[in-house]
Interface confidence: low
C-alpha cells in the first residue's frame, strides 16, 4: 500500500466507550509526556502530563480522576486512554515533550506529535463509511485547447471527515501537485474531491488517486486507478442512434455497494 | 495566566509581510512565549521562542516584536509564501524551566496567503461528466470573485464550489452537482462582469471527439465507430466497486 506521510489520523468512538490515542512523538530519555486537547474555536489546553520515571499521570485541576490514563506498552511508547466518552471529548489530541535543545539551556521548545482527531458520536452510521470514489477523466476540450488534462477524484459517504488524498503516477512514488476542495457535510456523512492537472505528455500514463481514511477496508490506503488516455478523432455516422452521447467525455461510473 | 489572539483570521498577498498580534497576562517576571504553526493536517510546528529577558527573537522569515511592559508579543512573517497559509498559535510557557511545564495557548489566528495583485484573467471553463455526476472545471482566473452555474432542468443536488490558488498564482475552481440529465448540463461562469460558457470551449469539428483510455492489454475497444470505450479499473482496495460504461 502507498505511504501517506504526516498527520491526518482519526479515531471514531461511540459515547460511553473508551478510546486510545497513540503518541507518534518518538523521544528517547523523555522524562515527561504531556497530553493536550485542541477543540475547534478554542485554545489548545493541557489535560495532564505523564511522569515517565514514576509511571504516574498528573492531571490538570478540575479534571476527573479515572478519565485519562497513560499506558506504556513498551519503553518510549505512550498511549492515552480516555474512558466513558462524551461528545465533548471530541477534538485533536496531541502528545508533547520538552526538547531541551542546547544542553546548556534549561529548555528550548515543546515538540508536539502530529495529532489525532477523536470523533465521539451517538449517530447510527452505515456499516460501511469508507470513502466511495467516482472518477472523472479530462474533457476533450481541455486536452485539445490546453494540451493538458484534469483528472478529478470524488469521494463520498465517508465518516469521519478526517481524510488525506494525494496523487501519484502508476510506477512512481513521487507525490504530484494536486488541488482539493473543502470537506463538505452531506447528511450524516462527508464528501471531498481532489483534482490533478497533467501536461499532455503525461496523459498516456496511468495515475492513482490515493486515499487515507480511518475506515478504509483493512486499514490500508485506497488506490483509485485513472486509466491512461489518448485523444482520438473518431468519424461518426450522424444517423447512428448512439451519437447523442458520443460527444461526452468517457463515462466511468464507479459505485460502491456494501457487502 | 491568559493569552489573547484578537485576530481570528487575516489575509495577505504573497511577498508581503503579515503581523499577528498576541497579548498575554501573567504575574511571572520571567517566562517564555512560543509561536506555533498548525498545518491543515493538524500538525503543530514550533516556529520561534521569545524569552522575557531576551532581545527580539528572529529566525529566518519569522521575527518577534516583544514589548514586555505592554505584555505584547507580535509575530511578523515576512516575504509571505502560499505555504504560509495556516493557523498560528501564541503560547505562554511556565517560568520554571522544568520538563513538567505546560503551555497556555491563545485561540489562534488563521492566515490566508492570497496571490499577488495582477492583471485580470478570464477563466477557461470545461465540463466533466460521469453518470449523474457533473463537474465544472474553471481554470486560471483572476481576481477570485466568481459565480459558477451548472445549467440543467433536472437538478438532484449541487455543492458549493471549491476555489483554490493555482500553481501559477491565479485561481482554479471546481463545482460539482448531480443531475438526472447530465448529458445536457452546461456550465456558465460570471467573472469580472462577463459571462463565460463551457460551450465556448467545445471543440468544433466535423467528427466527434473522444477522450478515451489508451489501449493496453486490459483495455479492449469494440470496433463499433460510436463506441463507449471500456476501462479496467483496479479495485483491490475498494469494497465491491462496479464499473459501468
Amino acid at each position: 500500500s502507498s505511504n501517506l506521510e504526516g498527520g491526518t489520523k482519526s479515531v471514531t468512538r461511540p459515547t460511553r466507550s473508551s478510546a486510545e490515542i497513540t503518541c507518534d512523538l518518538t523521544v528517547i530519555n523523555a522524562f515527561y509526556i504531556h497530553w493536550y486537547l485542541h477543540q475547534e474555536g478554542k485554545a489548545p489546553q493541557r489535560l495532564l502530563y505523564y511522569d515517565v520515571s514514576n509511571s504516574k499521570d498528573v492531571l490538570e485541576s478540575g479534571l476527573s480522576p479515572g478519565k485519562y490514563y497513560t499506558h506504556t506498552p513498551r519503553r518510549w511508547s505512550w498511549i492515552l486512554i480516555l474512558r466513558n466518552l462524551i461528545e465533548n471529548d471530541s477534538g485533536v489530541y496531541y502528545c508533547a515533550t520538552w526538547d531541551r535543545g542546547n544542553p546548556k539551556t534549561h529548555y528550548y521548545k515543546k515538540l508536539f506529535g502530529s495529532g489525532t482527531t477523536l470523533v465521539v458520536t451517538d449517530k447510527q452510521l452505515d456499516a460501511d463509511v469508507s470513502p466511495k470514489p467516482t472518477i472523472f477523466l479530462p474533457s476533450i476540450a481541455e486536452t485539445k485547447l490546453q494540451k493538458a488534462g484534469t483528472y478529478l477524484c470524488l469521494l463520498e459517504k465517508f465518516f469521519p471527515d478526517v481524510i488525506k488524498i494525494h496523487w501519484q503516477e502508476k510506477k512512481s512514488n513521487t507525490i504530484l501537485g494536486s488541488q482539493e476542495g473543502n470537506t463538505m457535510k452531506t447528511n450524516d456523512t462527508y464528501m471531498k474531491f481532489s483534482w490533478l492537472t497533467v501536461p499532455e505528455k503525461s496523459l498516456d500514463k496511468e495515475h492513482r488517486c490515493i486515499v487515507r481514511h480511518e475506515n478504509n477496508k483493512n486499514g490500508v490506503d485506497q488506490e483509485i486507478i485513472f486509466p491512461p488516455i489518448k485523444t482520438d478523432v473518431i468519424t461518426m455516422d450522424p444517423k447512428d442512434n448512439c451519437s447523442k452521447d458520443a460527444n461526452d467525455t468517457l463515462l466511468l461510473q464507479l459505485t460502491n455497494t456494501s457487502a | 495566566q491568559k493569552v489573547t489572539q484578537a485576530q481570528s483570521s487575516v489575509s495577505m498577498p504573497v511577498r508581503k509581510a503579515v503581523t499577528l498580534n498576541c497579548l498575554y497576562e501573567t504575574s511571572w517576571w520571567s517566562y517564555y512565549i512560543f509561536w506555533y504553526k498548525q498545518l491543515p493536517s493538524k500538525e503543530m510546528i514550533f516556529l520561534i521562542r521569545q524569552g522575557s529577558d531576551e532581545q527580539n527573537a528572529k529566525s529566518g522569515r519569522y521575527s518577534v516584536n516583544f514589548k514586555k511592559a505592554a505584555k505584547s508579543v507580535a509575530l511578523t512573517i515576512s516575504a509571505l509564501q502560499l505555504e504560509d497559509s495556516a493557523k498560528y498559535f501564541c503560547a505562554l510557557g511556565d517560568p520554571g524551566g522544568l520538563n513538567t511545564d505546560k503551555l497556555i495557548f491563545g485561540k489562534g489566528t488563521r492566515v490566508t496567503v492570497e496571490p499577488r495583485s495582477q492583471p485580470h484573467t478570464k477563466p477557461s471553463v470545461f465540463v466533466m461528466k460521469n453518470g449523474t455526476n457533473v463537474a465544472c472545471l474553471v481554470k486560471e482566473f483572476y481576481p477570485k470573485d466568481i459565480r459558477i452555474n451548472l445549467v440543467s432542468s433536472k437538478k438532484i443536488t449541487e455543492f458549493d464550489p471549491a476555489i483554490v490558488i493555482s500553481p501559477s498564482g491565479k485561481y482554479n475552481a471546481v463545482k460539482l452537482g448531480k443531475y438526472e440529465d447530465s448529458n445536457s448540463v452546461t456550465c456558465s461562469v460570471q467573472h469580472d462582469n462577463k459571462t463565460v460558457h463551457s460551450t465556448d470551449f467545445e471543440v468544433k469539428t466535423d467528427s466527434t471527439d473522444h477522450v478515451k483510455p489508451k489501449e493496453t492489454e486490459n483495455t479492449k475497444q469494440p470496433s463499433k465507430s460510436c463506441h463507449k470505450p471500456k476501462a479496467i479499473v483496479h479495485t483491490e482496495k475498494v469494497n465491491m466497486m462496479s464499473l459501468t460504461v
Epitope: G6, D24, T26, G101, N102, P103 | -
Partner: antibody, heavy 130, light 107 residues
C-alpha cells in the same frame, strides 16, 4: 538519491591545515545533521565532529577539540571540516555521514537527533607527515 | 564518555555458521546502538539501528538484540559476502563512540 562526496584530503606537514568538504545531494544539509568519522590505517572507526545546521550546534571529540571546526554552507548544501594544528595521529580516512531518520518525529531530549548513520561518503585520505 | 567494549576482536567461521558478536556499553545507552559492516577500502554500511531494528535492504539473516547494557549482532547463516569487519556504535550520548571492531574471517 542521497549522496555524500568528500574532498580536500591530501598530504600535509605536522602543524599544517586542511579543509575537507562534504557535498550533499538528495537531501538538504539544513534539515539534517552532518557527522565526520575517521579511520586511521588498519584501525577502527572514531567519531570526530557533528553539526546541526538548523540550530548551529556543534559537537567535537576531545581529541580534536580546539583544533578542528565543523561548519556548513546551506546555500551550497555542503559541510566542512577545517583541520588546524594537524598531528601525525590525525592521519586517517575521513568520512562524512548523515543520520537515518526512520520516524517523522525523532528527537532525543538532549537536543540532538537520536539516529544512526545510514549514508556515508566514499572517504578522503588525510596524511600528516614530515 | 560511554565505552563500547566489543568482542571478539576477530573470529574464523565457515559459510553457513551462526556468528555472534557482542558489545558492552560502560553505562546505559537506552537502545541507541547501531551495527555496521565494513569491507576493505569501503565506507561502513548500516545493518542494525536502535539495537534491534533491521535497516532497509539488509538481509534478514542479520539481527540485533539488547539485554541491559549488552548488545548482540547475530548472523544466522554466514554467507561468502559477510566476511568483513563489524562495528557497534552508541549514538545516545556525545561523544559518539564505536567498538574496536570484529573481523570475521574465513576458516
Amino acid at each position: 538519491e542521497v549522496q555524500l562526496v568528500e574532498s580536500g584530503g591530501g598530504l600535509v606537514q605536522p602543524g599544517g591545515s586542511l579543509r575537507l568538504s562534504c557535498a550533499a545531494s538528495g537531501f538538504t544539509v539544513s534539515s539534517s545533521s552532518i557527522h565526520w568519522v575517521r579511520q586511521a590505517p588498519g584501525k577502527g572507526l572514531e567519531w570526530v565532529a557533528s553539526i546541526y545546521s538548523s540550530s548551529g550546534y556543534t559537537y567535537y571529540a576531545d581529541s580534536v577539540k580546539g583544533r578542528f571546526t565543523i561548519s556548513a554552507d546551506t546555500s551550497k548544501n555542503t559541510a566542512y571540516l577545517q583541520m588546524n594544528s594537524l598531528r601525525a595521529e590525525d592521519t586517517a580516512v575521513y568520512y562524512c555521514a548523515r543520520p537515518y531518520y526512520w520516524y517523522p518525529y525523532y528527537y532525543w531530549s538532549g537536543g540532538w537527533e537520536y539516529a544512526a548513520f545510514d549514508y556515508w561518503g566514499q572517504g578522503t585520505l588525510v596524511t600528516v607527515s614530515s | 564518555d560511554i565505552q563500547m567494549t566489543q568482542s571478539p576482536s576477530s573470529l574464523s567461521a565457515s559459510v553457513g555458521d551462526r556468528v555472534t558478536i557482542t558489545c558492552r556499553a560502560s553505562q546505559s545507552v537506552s537502545s541507541a546502538v547501531a551495527w555496521y559492516q565494513q569491507k576493505p577500502g569501503k565506507a561502513p554500511k548500516l545493518l542494525i539501528y536502535s539495537a534491534s531494528s533491521l535497516y532497509s535492504g539488509v538481509p534478514s539473516r542479520f539481527s540485533g538484540s539488547r539485554s541491559g547494557t549488552d548488545f548482540t549482532l547475530t548472523i544466522s547463516s554466514l554467507q561468502p559476502e559477510d566476511f568483513a569487519t563489524y562495528y557497534c556504535q552508541q549514538y545516545g550520548e556525545y561523544p559518539i563512540t564505536f567498538g574496536q571492531g570484529t573481523k570475521v574471517e574465513i576458516k
